[in-house]
Interface confidence: low
Amino acid sequence: MMTGTIETTGNISAEKGGSIILQCHLSSTTAQVTQVNWEQQDQLLAICNADLGWHISPSFKDRVAPGPGLGLTLQSLTVNDTGEYFCIYHTYPDGTYTGRIFLEVLESSVAEHGARFQIP
């Protein structure tokens, strides 16, 4: 039975040219996290494997940095980075937990952070 929940940074905004940290946190479970995938709907950004460490997709190597922790830092943001991002926690023995973050990259200098929320 999957008892865990994923807490994410929720809906967030950032300025064009800046950077943002995408973070998810798995709680309420004793399952072992074997791997975390960071993805957009159509692309794999990065993998953090418990044994093999980090792998950043070649097309994102210049703009994506691993961490902090199991999170992911996106740099040199463009308006095209606006969209959904998913943290996919592969765990044993529970299975897979997915968290969703929506990032809006703004042209203006006003970028407010949204509230945190949970996905069961």
């Epitope: 993805e39 709907q41 159509d42 692309q43 794999l44 996919i88 299975g95």
Partner: nanobody, 122 residues
Framework: QVKLEESGGGLVQAGGSLRLSCAAS????????MRWYRQAPGKQRELVAS????????YYIDSVKGRFTISRDNAKNIVYLDMRSLEPADTAVYLC???????????????WGHGTQVTVSS
Amino acid sequence: QVKLEESGGGLVQAGGSLRLSCAASGSILSAGVMRWYRQAPGKQRELVASIALDGSTGYYIDSVKGRFTISRDNAKNIVYLDMRSLEPADTAVYLCNANIRTDMRSAPFDHWGHGTQVTVSS
């Protein structure tokens, strides 16, 4: 209801080749990154290869680079794994995995196939 079904596994001699297929069926709006995992007896499940919606390859585990090729047919929602120069260490159950979105309002849900056995004899 979404189903992932693998095929193409079997028994092969070392140095041989196999092509695995995984077909996603059901109510599918879009299938994002699709992946092949494998699990050998007594070992942790490991990601072998992944491929993005646009066909760009996101990842190969080091031990299969240059020997395995992942590809996909978006029109049919099928992902393939072409395996050549197979080694006994490649023996495992190979499982297909994808985050499949069934409607625009929900996040993609993680789906798994049941797996297909690949046995490489020396």
